[in-house]
C-alpha cells in the first residue's frame, strides 16, 4: 500500500464544535487524573473574562514534558490569533498568583462549560 500525500485535511470546524472538543479534552484530563497533574507544576492564574484563550495558552505553554496537557496546549494554540511562545506574557497582564495545573484546568473547564451553555461560541 502506498500513502499518497500527507494527512487528509479535516473539514472546517465550527466554533461551537471546537469549543466542545476543548471541553471534552479538559473533562478527559480531570477524570483520568491519578497522580498530581504535571507533577504538581504551578502556572499563572488568569482572568477568565479577559481574552482567555491566549492567556490560558501563555500560562500553560510554560509547562513542558507533561503529556497529559499536550493536546490542550495544541488546541489552545488554534484558539489564539497570534503565536505564543514559552516565556511570553503579552496577554497575561496581571501575574500575581500561581496555582497548580490541575486547579487551572478545573477553573478553565468550569468557565468554558458556562460559555457553552450560554451559547457563547466566540
Amino acid at each position: 500500500l502506498t500513502c499518497l500525500g500527507g494527512f487528509a485535511s479535516p473539514g472546517p470546524v465550527p466554533p461551537s464544535t471546537a469549543l466542545r472538543e476543548l471541553i471534552e479534552e479538559l473533562v478527559n484530563i480531570t477524570q483520568n487524573q491519578k497522580a498530581p497533574l504535571c507533577n504538581g507544576s504551578m502556572v499563572w492564574s488568569i482572568n477568565l473574562t479577559a481574552g482567555m484563550y491566549c492567556a490560558a495558552l501563555e500560562s500553560l505553554i510554560n509547562v513542558s514534558g507533561c503529556s497529559a496537557i499536550e493536546k490542550t496546549q495544541r488546541m489552545l494554540s488554534g484558539f489564539c490569533p497570534h503565536k505564543v511562545s514559552a516565556g511570553q506574557f503579552s496577554s497575561l497582564h496581571v501575574r500575581d498568583t500561581k496555582i497548580e495545573v490541575a486547579q487551572f484546568v478545573k477553573d478553565l473547564l468550569l468557565h468554558l462549560k458556562k460559555l457553552f451553555r450560554e451559547g457563547q461560541f466566540n
Epitope: 471546537a18 479577559a50 484563550y53 491566549c54 488554534g78 484558539f79 490569533p81 497570534h82 503565536k83 466566540n122
Partner: antibody, heavy 118, light 109 residues
Framework: EVQLQQSGAELVKPGASVKLSCTAS????????MHWVKQRTEQGLEWIGR????????KYAPKFHDKATLTADTSSNTAYLQFSSLASEDTAVYYC???????????WGQGTLVTVSA | QAVVTQESVLTTSPGETVTLTCRSS?????????ANWVQEKPDHLFTGLIG???NRAPGVPARFSGSLIGDKAALTITGAQTEDEAIYFC?????????FGSGTKVTVL
C-alpha cells in the same frame, strides 16, 4: 526593516490553480503566524486563513477550506497561498500579513492581483 | 457563520472625536473576540491599528484607541486629523477564524 514582498500579478483560466508567494525580510516567519486576506474590487476584506510556518499548522475560514492551501518554507522565509479550481469570483487582490500580539495585522505585503478569465 | 457589522460612513471635522463600532451577529463582542482594527488608505495601503480589543500597534498615534462599548467593539479617534480620512475595517476572532466587517469610510472635512 520589516517587509513582505509578494509575487507578481497572475492571469489564469477558470478551473486552473495558482500559487502566490510572500517573502519576508527583517524577521523570521517561524516566529509569527502569517495570515492571508482577500480583497475584491470595491469590496471589503475577507480573511482566508493563517499558517504557523514553524510546524505548518493551519486554520482556514470556512468558505476557503476547500479552496485555499497555505504552506511555508522557513529556509527561504516565504509563505505561500495556493488557490485551486479558480472561478471568476476568485478575481481579487490577495495580501499576506504578519500578525502578533504587539503588531496585529501590522505589516502587509503589497498584494497580488489574480485575474480569472477565459 | 457570524456577520460583523460596521457603520458605512462617518463624517467628522478636524479636532473632533469620532467613534466607530463593530457588532457581532452572534451576540456581545467580548475580549475573546480579540477585536482588531485595520486602516486602508488609497492605493491599498493597509495598517493594523489595534489588536486584542485595546492593544495599539507600535507607531500608531495615541489618538487611536480601542475598547468595548456595550455589546460592541469600538475604535475612537480623539482629535481627528485630515490624514485619518480612510476606510477602517474591524475583524473579530471566532475561536478559530477571523471575520472582517464591511468597513467604515471616515471622512474628515
Amino acid at each position: 526593516e520589516v517587509q513582505l514582498q509578494q509575487s507578481g500579478a497572475e492571469l489564469v483560466k477558470p478551473g486552473a490553480s495558482v500559487k502566490l508567494s510572500c517573502t519576508a525580510s527583517g524577521f523570521n516567519i517561524k516566529d509569527y503566524y502569517m495570515h492571508w486576506v482577500k480583497q475584491r474590487t470595491e469590496q471589503g476584506l475577507e480573511w482566508i486563513g493563517r499558517i504557523d510556518p514553524e510546524d505548518g499548522e493551519t486554520k482556514y475560514a470556512p468558505k476557503f477550506h476547500d479552496k485555499a492551501t497555505l504552506t511555508a518554507d522557513t529556509s527561504s522565509n516565504t509563505a505561500y497561498l495556493q488557490f485551486s479550481s479558480l472561478a471568476s469570483e476568485d478575481t481579487a487582490v490577495y495580501y499576506c500579513t504578519r500578525y502578533d500580539y504587539y503588531g496585529p495585522f501590522a505589516y502587509w505585503g503589497q498584494g497580488t492581483l489574480v485575474t480569472v478569465s477565459a | 457563520q457570524a456577520v460583523v457589522t460596521q457603520e458605512s460612513v462617518l463624517t467628522t471635522s478636524p479636532g473632533e472625536t469620532v467613534t466607530l463600532t463593530c457588532r457581532s451577529s452572534t451576540g456581545a463582542v467580548t475580549t475573546s473576540n480579540y477585536a482588531n482594527w485595520v486602516q486602508e488608505k488609497p492605493d491599498h495601503l493597509f495598517t493594523g491599528l489595534i489588536g486584542g480589543t485595546n492593544n495599539r500597534a507600535p507607531g500608531v498615534p495615541a489618538r487611536f484607541s480601542g475598547s468595548l462599548i456595550g455589546d460592541k467593539a469600538a475604535l475612537t479617534i480623539t482629535g481627528a486629523q485630515t490624514e485619518d480620512e480612510a476606510i477602517y475595517f474591524c475583524a473579530l476572532w471566532y475561536i478559530n477564524h477571523f471575520i472582517f466587517g464591511s468597513g467604515t469610510k471616515v471622512t474628515v472635512l
